[in-house]
């Protein structure tokens, strides 16, 4: 669709005569008839296939034609067409004399024609005017013409319809060739697709308007590129939603079981070495001079009975000192000047001479030790207490002080963690080496079955058309991630087919 525009500029008829040569009385009151038609090699009479237009009387004899387009007048003349512009045309312009006010063809005498011009040729659509001048024996007509497209029509032949819009169906303006030019923030064939916030994750994020980033279930962050771990995950991370991958030193479904008590709590005192031995379990290896489960107790250096042969020990600031009995010398009274004749063996020990009487050895009765049988046997030296229990000498016997969770003479028995029925909601308790485990009935979870869990909203496969289903643990609902071409809360509607709602 477009318009052929003809702008009449000047008509010269100096003698004021008709085509027949007869003069007009009193002068030639001139108006024009225009016929636009398809291209003819020789322009001949016949239907004006592209349209006709007539002017009022524009002047007498010779006159210039005023441009009336701005004032809503009829110059340039408009010849609209509702078809694809073919690029060629034939144009006939007739100048007529109007003796009276009636300009209809049937009201005019046949000899009222002043002049007739006919042209044909090629004409491309465009804003530029083509100037032409046609001269006959008695008259001269100067004019210009062009073809332009109607509003919303574009292209070389005004065949492309394009109407700018900014609504649900598109966000664009039209280029000179009729192609769409998307408004900022929109893309796609019809500019219906918003351009999301720069960097918004292609799979995990989406947008409904430009420069936003909405996260799909299980994702968060400005660009929807951070996964949300499993609800209840304490010391863990995720690489996909609802995972709980434990940090170093943590274990269990929710990464809440401390497998590295040593690092997280530093229980061993006074420079002792800590060794992990299971969940919340550890052993401290004390430095010399310290004792206790956590090496919190300072030992007197004389407690280890370093003085031999009945020597008495004295604590000093920088260590200890042995006071040796007669016949012995050395740092620990370990050297003897005695022989069996001096009866050096205490507590009923029997003396045996060595090296031709230059030396001796004592054979001690049970419960005594030392080179002179001077020491009672310390039943704790063999570390008989298991599971980090503390050994205590009690006269002729010994006993073990056990750490929490252990019992028995040597702390060798693990107290059943299940004895106190720790599993809630009818969970089944299982004793493990380093604790317990609860097997929960349906609908409950957590270390002690204390968490009431919702039914997996995706279990019923609510999403259609191969959509991906996500369970939002915080709301107990499902969300369907639709494949391309489907919409709806369950991805049940193909794009382009509006859903039929009951209202």
């Amino acid at each position: 669709s477009g318009v052929f525009q003809l702008q009449l500029q000047e008509f010269i008829n100096e003698r004021g005569v008709l085509a027949s040569g007869r003069p007009c009385e009193p002068g030639c009151r001139t108006f024009f008839r225009v016929c636009l038609k398809h291209f003819q090699a020789v322009v001949s009479p016949g239907p004006c296939t592209f349209g006709t237009v007539s002017t009022p009387v524009l002047g007498t004899n010779s006159f210039a034609v005023r441009d009336d387009s701005s004032g809503g007048g009829r110059n340039p003349l408009q010849l609209p067409f509702n078809f694809t512009w073919p690029g060629t045309f034939s144009l006939i312009i007739e100048a007529w004399h109007a003796p009276g006010d009636d300009l209809r063809p049937e009201a005019l005498p046949p000899d009222a024609l002043i002049s007739k011009i006919a042209i044909q040729g090629s004409l491309a659509v465009g804003q530029n005017w083509l100037l032409d001048e046609q001269t006959s024996t008695l008259t001269r007509l100067r004019y210009s013409y062009r073809v332009i497209c109607s509003d919303n029509y574009y292209g070389d032949n005004c065949s492309r319809l394009c109407k700018k819009r900014n609504d649900h169906f598109g966000h664009y303006v039209c280029q000179p060739d009729g192609n769409l030019s998307c408004l900022p923030g929109w893309t796609g064939e019809y500019c219906q697709q918003p351009i999301c916030l720069s960097g918004c994750h292609e799979q995990n994020g989406y947008c409904s308007k430009p420069a936003e980033c909405l996260c799909r279930p299980g994702w968060q962050g400005r660009l929807c590129n951070e996964c949300i771990p499993h609800n209840g995950c304490r010391h863990g991370t995720c690489s996909t939603p609802w995972q709980c991958t434990c940090d170093e030193g943590w274990g269990g479904l929710f990464c809440d079981q401390d497998l590295n008590y040593c690092t997280h709590h530093s229980p061993c005192k006074n420079g002792a070495t800590c060794s992990n031995s299971g969940q919340r379990s550890y052993t401290c290896t004390c430095r010399p001079g310290y004792t206790g489960v956590d090496c919190e107790l300072e030992l007197s250096e004389c407690d280890s009975n370093p003085c031999r042969n009945g020597g008495s020990c004295k604590d000093q600031e920088d260590g200890y000192h042995c006071l040796c009995p007669p016949g012995y010398y050395g740092l620990h009274c370990e050297h003897s000047t005695l022989s069996c004749a001096d009866s050096p063996c205490f507590n009923g020990g029997s003396c045996r001479e060595r090296n031709q009487g230059a030396n001796y050895a004592c054979e001690c009765p049970p419960n005594f030790t030392g080179s002179n049988c001077e020491k009672k046997v310390d039943r704790c030296t063999s570390n008989p207490c298991a599971n980090g229990g503390q050994c205590l000498n009690r006269g002729p016997s010994r006993m073990c002080r056990c750490r929490p969770g252990f019992t028995g003479t040597y702390c060798e028995l693990h107290v059943s963690d299940c004895a106190r029925n720790p599993c809630a909601h009818g969970g089944t308790c299982h004793d493990l080496e380093n604790g317990l485990m609860c097997t929960c009935p349906a609908g409950f979870s957590g270390r002690r079955c204390e968490v009431r869990t919702s039914i997996d909203a995706c279990a019923s496969s609510p999403c259609f058309n191969r959509a991906t289903c996500y369970t939002d643990l915080s709301t107990d609902t499902f969300v369907c991630n639709c494949p391309y071409g489907f919409v709806g809360s369950r991805c049940e509607f193909p794009v382009g087919l509006p859903p039929s709602f009951p209202w």
């Epitope: 916030l197 947008c207 420069a211 936003e212 980033c213 909405l214 996260c215 968060q220 962050g221 400005r222 660009l223 951070e226 949300i228 771990p229 499993h230 609800n231 209840g232 995950c233 304490r234 915080s474 709301t475």
Partner: nanobody, 123 residues
Framework: EVQLVESGGGLVQPGGSLRLSCAAS????????MSWVRQAPGKGPEWVSA????????YYADSVKGRFTISRDNAKNTLYLQMNSLTPEDTAVYYC????????????????WGQGTQVTVSS
């Protein structure tokens, strides 16, 4: 059930300070980004500040930058907003929220909201 309970609002003079708290329950607080949103009388909700799940990244609206500080204590399941140099324009109901979507300046869609706490700045 997700619950967000704000506290710490009140009447304060221009130039004064307030500290808002948001106690969270019903979800693993330390796994979620959090945000503060406010709504002045007769106006729409306005994003104020946001913080990522670990607390290492913080974001502020231009109107509060340099005056407000967002922080969180994951061990206590609590979100905070320290507001200094308050002006009458800061008068609003302040909400703690879990963001679901972001725009060019900050969060603008939310999965959950608290019930809000009123902050009034007036002499």
């Amino acid at each position: 059930e997700v619950q967000l309970v704000e506290s710490g609002g009140g009447l304060v003079q221009p130039g004064g300070s307030l500290r808002l708290s948001c106690a969270a329950s019903g979800f693993t607080f330390g796994s979620y980004d959090m945000s503060w949103v406010r709504q002045a009388p007769g106006k729409g909700p306005e994003w104020v500040s946001a913080i990522n799940s670990g607390g290492g990244s913080t974001y502020y609206a231009d109107s509060v930058k340099g005056r407000f500080t967002i922080s969180r204590d994951n061990a206590k399941n609590t979100l905070y907003l320290q507001m200094n140099s308050l002006t009458p324009e800061d008068t609003a109901v302040y909400y703690c929220a879990i963001p679901r979507g972001w725009g060019p300046t900050g969060p603008h869609e939310y999965a959950y909201w608290g019930q809000g706490t009123q902050v009034t700045v007036s002499s």
